[in-house]
């Protein structure tokens, strides 16, 4: 059984901001803009690492930066879970872990992060630019998914930058509220944007980081704002698809949307948010999908010889939340 505060919170490797000090007056509005847009919204970060000892072995680490309790984590490769990706592992905080070859070991690192080691041999082994995706289902934030991959030129032992830009976005908007400081910041942002509207925008660029080697940064977000401030960048489209697995098949069914309790006066026919205020997306590559009561369609992976089933603890047990962090 997983209980509250069972393990320390794990901070993800932080994306850097290049040249931030040189453009302080220009960076500030963009920092404020990011904070205004993403305040209170959770994030998923993904880190893909090729092992130096086994060149074809990968470690995927994923974490959830949100205040809610996690009910399920799904790791897939070849794309997002509901969009052609193939399920590698499903982790439930209480009921155990299921994984499919070539996944070798999936485990919880903390209450909000997981790791998955992939076997590197055989036809189903991943290649360097395979995209790996992690989807966290959490209350009250909903389902959030982010993807990451190793660039083909990556050195062994180095990791891809963590990718906190979610593909599926969901938030019970307004449930955390907006602080007065943030409100002031947004007003100040408008003032600054008015002043600087004819100046070129700063170039924010994520830098590559290794989890073993903390690096000096000219400017870093505070711990409190890390869940809200991030540098978004697009998921790398992979041209290297994994070989067909006999244990897990890609999804072929139509997409669907579950019914969605919201504050609206009627039950929506399509996807909707828990609350009536949508969260704006940042950048055209981020698609806003309110996924707490609206899940992207997926067919269950088929059980096969490569399946490792961790036994389900039976009987009544205490739970620390309705979603499985119990």
């Amino acid at each position: 059984m997983r209980t509250e505060a069972q393990v320390p919170a794990l901070q993800p490797p932080e994306p850097g901001l290049e040249g931030a000090m040189g453009h302080r007056t220009l960076v500030l509005p963009w920092v404020l803009l990011t904070l205004c847009v993403t305040a209170g919204t959770p994030e998923v970060w993904v880190q893909v690492r090729m092992e130096a000892t086994e060149l074809s072995s990968f470690t995927i680490r994923c974490g959830f930066l949100g205040s809610g309790s996690i009910s399920l984590v799904t790791v897939s490769w070849g794309g997002p879970n509901g969009a052609g990706g193939t399920t590698l592992a499903v982790l439930h905080p209480e009921r155990g872990i299921r994984q499919w070859a070539p996944a070798r070991q999936a485990r919880w690192e903390t209450q909000s992060s997981i790791s998955l080691i992939l076997e590197g041999s055989g036809a189903s082994s991943p290649c360097a630019n395979t995209t790996f995706c992690c989807k966290f289902a959490s209350f009250p934030e909903g389902s959030w998914e982010a993807c990451g991959s190793l660039p083909p030129s990556s050195d062994p032992g180095l990791s891809a930058p963590p990718t906190p830009a979610p593909i599926l976005r969901a938030d019970l908007a307004g449930i955390l509220g907006v602080s007065g400081v943030l409100l002031f910041g947004c007003v100040y942002l408008l003032h600054l944007l008015r002043r600087h509207k004819h100046r070129p925008a700063p170039r924010l660029q994520p830098s590559r980081t290794s989890p073993q080697a903390p690096r000096a940064r000219a400017w870093a977000p505070s711990q409190a704002s890390q869940a809200a401030l991030h540098v978004p960048y697009a998921t790398i489209n992979t041209s290297c698809r994994p070989a067909t697995l006999d244990t897990a098949h890609p999804h072929g069914g139509p997409s669907w949307w579950a019914s969605l309790p919201t504050h609206a006066a009627h039950r929506p026919q399509g996807p909707a948010a828990w609350a009536s205020t949508p969260i704006p997306a940042r950048g055209s590559f981020v698609s806003v999908e309110n996924g707490l009561y609206a899940q992207a369609g997926e067919r269950p992976p088929h059980t096969g010889p490569g399946l490792t089933l961790f036994p389900d603890p039976r009987g009544p047990r205490a739970m620390e939340g309705p979603l499985g962090v119990r």
């Epitope: 509250e4 505060a5 205040s67 809610g68 309790s69 009910s71 399920l72 799904t74 499903v90 439930h92 905080p93 009921r95 155990g96 299921r98 289902a137 209350f139 009250p140 909903g142 389902s143 669907w256 949307w257 579950a258 019914s259 969605l260 309790p261 707490l292 009561y293 899940q295 369609g297 997926e298 067919r299 269950p300 992976p301 389900d312 039976r314 009544p316 047990r317 205490a318 739970m319 620390e320 939340g321 309705p322 979603l323 499985g324 119990r326």
Partner: antibody, heavy 120, light 112 residues
Framework: QVQLVQSGAEVKKPGSSVKVSCKAS????????ISWVRQAPGQGLEWMGD???????NYAQKFQGRVTITADESTSTAYMELSSLRSEDTAVYYC??????????????WGQGTMVTVSS | DIVMTQSPLSLPVTPGEPASISCRSS???????????LDWYLQKPGQSPQLLIY???TRASGVPDRFSGSGSGTDFTLKISRVEAEDVGVYYC?????????FGGGTKVEIK
């Protein structure tokens, strides 16, 4: 939109078993929790247990050993089998599903209910 | 098991008037996330239950704003600001804080 459609009413003898089905249409099945809740005539609601098809089932202590909740992922159908029936098991049996993967509740989607009558 | 106690058992109401139902749990339903894992359901005559309020105070889809939930820890209240004829039925509170999930005994709301 997800719907849960249950099997029809049953009349059973004491000591026998009943198996009620609950078919989910319009959505993913394997990673969602489907609960079974029963309601005796004129009485309140009672949670019996649940299943997340990909992981397995979980039962209330009261029904442990007498109830079996299973699922067929290929047909997106959950089943609740109650054995050693007695007259006090006469009730409407509901299946219900929560909104989020891995989550037991709140139950935003309910089946229409299946009346099970235990009578000699 | 967490015991849920509802009061009153029966509540005769006048359309247009407010109504209030109380629910008390034997253990705190407050989670570390700050949410109270208590839900309210309405079961209209001859129908399956329907979700009204979840996590103590959030209205579900399609639920009129005359319904509101409040409370924290062990004491919770469902309020109907102006009762309408269609609100009749049995109201249940349910805790999802701990297995097994348990329901209150129900409050029957009927028009006077």
């Amino acid at each position: 939109q997800v719907q849960l459609v249950q099997s029809g009413a049953e009349v059973k003898k004491p000591g026998s078993s009943v198996k009620v089905s609950c078919k989910a249409s319009g959505g993913t099945f394997s990673t969602f929790a489907i609960s079974w809740v029963r309601q005796a005539p004129g009485q309140g609601l009672e949670w019996m247990g649940d299943i997340i098809p990909i992981f397995g089932s979980n039962y209330a202590q009261k029904f442990q050993g007498r109830v079996t909740i299973t699922a067929d992922e290929s047909t997106s159908t959950a089943y609740m089998e109650l054995s050693s029936l007695r007259s006090e098991d006469t009730a409407v049996y509901y299946c219900a599903r929560g909104p989020l993967e891995g989550k037991v509740s709140p139950f935003d989607i309910w089946g229409q209910g299946t009346m099970v009558t235990v009578s000699s | 098991d967490i015991v849920m106690t509802q009061s009153p058992l029966s509540l005769p109401v006048t359309p247009g008037e407010p109504a209030s139902i109380s629910c008390r749990s034997s253990q705190s339903l407050l989670h570390s996330t700050g949410y109270n894992y208590l839900d309210w359901y309405l079961q209209k005559p001859g129908q399956s239950p329907q979700l009204l309020i979840y996590v103590g105070s959030t209205r579900a889809s399609g639920v009129p704003d005359r319904f509101s939930g409040s409370g924290s820890g062990t004491d919770f209240t469902l309020k109907i600001s102006r009762v309408e004829a269609e609100d009749v039925g049995v109201y249940y509170c349910m805790q999802e804080r701990q297995f097994p999930i348990t329901f209150g005994g129900g409050t029957k709301v009927e028009i006077k």
